[in-house]
């Protein structure tokens, strides 16, 4: 008995070959002897029932001259899994068709961190093995249900599932979209008074995007977090619902989500968490954002540089006179110089690879007042 594997919704070709390699009479039947189609000597395809009943069944007329009389079944259904009989030249050829189906749990659009379940439906009596490969090359294998927990952004794309049965295989392609922000976390470094731009680009595109969001902020100086802004998203259009008076954030009306803080001030330095709840989805998308603020000041005979916000303990804060060696350099959040000499002083926040933030302050001779450029 020949075995043919098929995929639900697609087409299968069941073979039937003549030893003569020429056109001959043939008939395809179900195992209960009901006729499906055939050719009775006039080169005309005759169907065994009403057109509506047999419109999915066909043959390849062009192949008949070569002694090949395949049965083509279009728009395969799971119930097409059965034995088919080809009668020709006083012999019967049995062909077993097994139709498989691989589906993703409920939805192919899943939030980052959620689980993906891929389910194989197979005909009774079959014992297939299945292996699925993610777009980033991760292989999962198992029985009729395969699960991937904690979906990552890199899991977005085409998953390829290979079903193996009796050394024959059939391949399924399933497009999965992982709903997430492009970045899990970002840090913005600003001098006091500068405008701050926060951007929250999404890592996916969909036709219509509807939901609601909120930015909660934990300022370093505050004992508790507070909601800075809430907004709605309707078909990719952003509308602000509520915003605090201090700070008065502004929000862009289009995607990507974009927030502007008019001024970076020490009291705003800290960490925020933007959440986005999408319509018809359980769970929320999250992006962490951090703000580090630097202030350089001169009070009487003391030049001070301070930073506020979530900095790595490896960062170095330095005060130096332009084009000279650093006068003071510490892995702390504040440094100062007593009786600084006149000139342009630089406050630098650096790590092993770069200067992250720089603020200049002009120290005038002692009889003048300082100027901040």
């Amino acid at each position: 008995k020949t075995l043919v594997l098929g995929k639900e919704g697609e087409s299968a070709e069941l073979p039937c070959e003549s030893s003569q390699k020429k056109i001959t009479v043939f008939t395809w039947k179900f195992s209960d002897q009901r006729k499906i189609l055939g050719q009775h000597g006039k080169g005309v395809l005759i169907r065994g029932g009403s057109p509506s009943q047999f419109d999915r069944f066909d043959s390849k007329k062009g192949a008949w001259e070569k002694g090949s009389f395949p049965l083509i079944i279009n728009k395969l259904k799971m119930e097409d899994s059965q034995t088919y009989i080809c009668e020709l030249e006083n012999r019967k050829e049995e062909v077993e068709l097994w139709v498989f189906k691989v589906t993703a749990n409920s939805d192919t659009h899943l939030l980052q961190g959620q689980s993906l379940t891929l389910t194989l439906e197979s005909p009774p009596g079959s014992s297939p093995s299945v292996q699925c490969r993610s777009p980033r090359g991760k292989n999962i294998q198992g029985g009729k249900t395969l699960s991937v927990s904690q979906l990552e952004l890199q899991d977005s794309g085409t998953w390829t599932c290979t079903v193996l049965q009796n050394q024959k295989k059939v391949e399924f392609k399933i497009d999965i979209v992982v709903l997430a922000f492009q970045k899990a976390s970002s840090i913005v470094y600003k001098k006091e008074g500068e405008q701050v731009e926060f951007s929250f680009p999404l890592a996916f595109t969909v036709e219509k995007l509807t939901g609601s969001g909120e930015l909660w902020w934990q300022a370093e100086r505050a004992s508790s977090s507070k909601s800075w802004i809430t907004f709605d998203l309707k078909n990719k259009e952003v509308s602000v619902k509520r915003v605090t008076q201090d700070p008065k954030l502004q929000m862009g009306k289009k995607l990507p989500l974009h927030l502007t803080l008019p001024q970076a001030l020490p009291q705003y330095a800290g960490s925020g968490n933007l959440t986005l709840a999408l319509e018809a989805k359980t769970g929320k998308l999250h992006q962490e954002v951090n703000l580090v603020v630097m202030r350089a000041t001169q009070l009487q005979k003391n030049l001070t540089c301070e930073v506020w916000g979530p900095t790595s303990p490896k960062l170095m804060l330095s005060l130096k006179l332009e084009n000279k060696e650093a006068k003071v350099s510490k892995r702390e959040k504040a440094v100062w110089v007593l009786n600084p000499e006149a000139g342009m002083w630089q406050c630098l926040l650096s790590d092993s690879g770069q200067v992250l933030l720089e603020s200049n302050i002009k120290v005038l001779p002692t009889w003048s007042t300082p100027v901040q450029p």
Epitope: S185, S186, I187, Y189, N290, V292, T311, S312, P313, K314, L315, M316, S318, A326, S329, L349, S350, D351, S352, G353, Q354, L356
Partner: antibody, heavy 122, light 107 residues
Framework: QVQLVESGGGVVQPGRSLRLSCAAS????????IHWFRQAPGKGLEWVAI????????FYADSVKGRFTISRDNSKNTVNLQMNSLRVEDTAIYYC???????????????WGNGTTVTVSS | AIQMTQSPSSLSASVGDRVTITCRAS??????LGWYQQKPGKAPMLLIY???NLQNGVPSRFSGSRSGTDFTLTISGLQPEDFAAYFC?????????FGQGTKLDVK
Amino acid sequence: QVQLVESGGGVVQPGRSLRLSCAASGFTFSSYGIHWFRQAPGKGLEWVAIIWFDGTNKFYADSVKGRFTISRDNSKNTVNLQMNSLRVEDTAIYYCAREVAIQGYYYYMDVWGNGTTVTVSS
Amino acid sequence: AIQMTQSPSSLSASVGDRVTITCRASQDIRNGLGWYQQKPGKAPMLLIYTTSNLQNGVPSRFSGSRSGTDFTLTISGLQPEDFAAYFCLQDYNYPYTFGQGTKLDVK
């Protein structure tokens, strides 16, 4: 391509000095911190020192502080490790590695040299 | 200095197995932890940085996670080339410190 090559290893008596070099190529050297790590025979890895991108800041493991000095020459794309008052326990393979620093948050050593062997023995 | 306690020190497994290695930090290091693989006679190779970020070119069977001060490296579906030594490294603060290492060999 991006690479680091160590040199200067050898056999030396306790109390003597040795100077290791790390030559970089294939990247903008002056934008990266460079570390020295070491691995004693059959043992785990140990961090030794780092020098920042501009040479202004240097940090050392307690076990080498006061004996080893790290320096760099950005015009020659090299980092040196001057090792004085060497001890038997300094015997190891010494690796230099490039540190990537992003946003003052993400740090990692993505490029390593193949190592140079230092043997301190009387 | 921050101490990193890595376990197990050695591990025997078979191709296809799922393997986990853990590192515990003696204090809060936020996400400042990387995982490195080392084969005999070779330099270490970066696998995961900042707790859970997969380095370019590293197979996706490697993943990292964190719970408080406990960090985990997971290899899902061991391949023959994965038998090696694995080290965690805290890069949160100086001095950087490594875990003692885990030697992964064939069962």
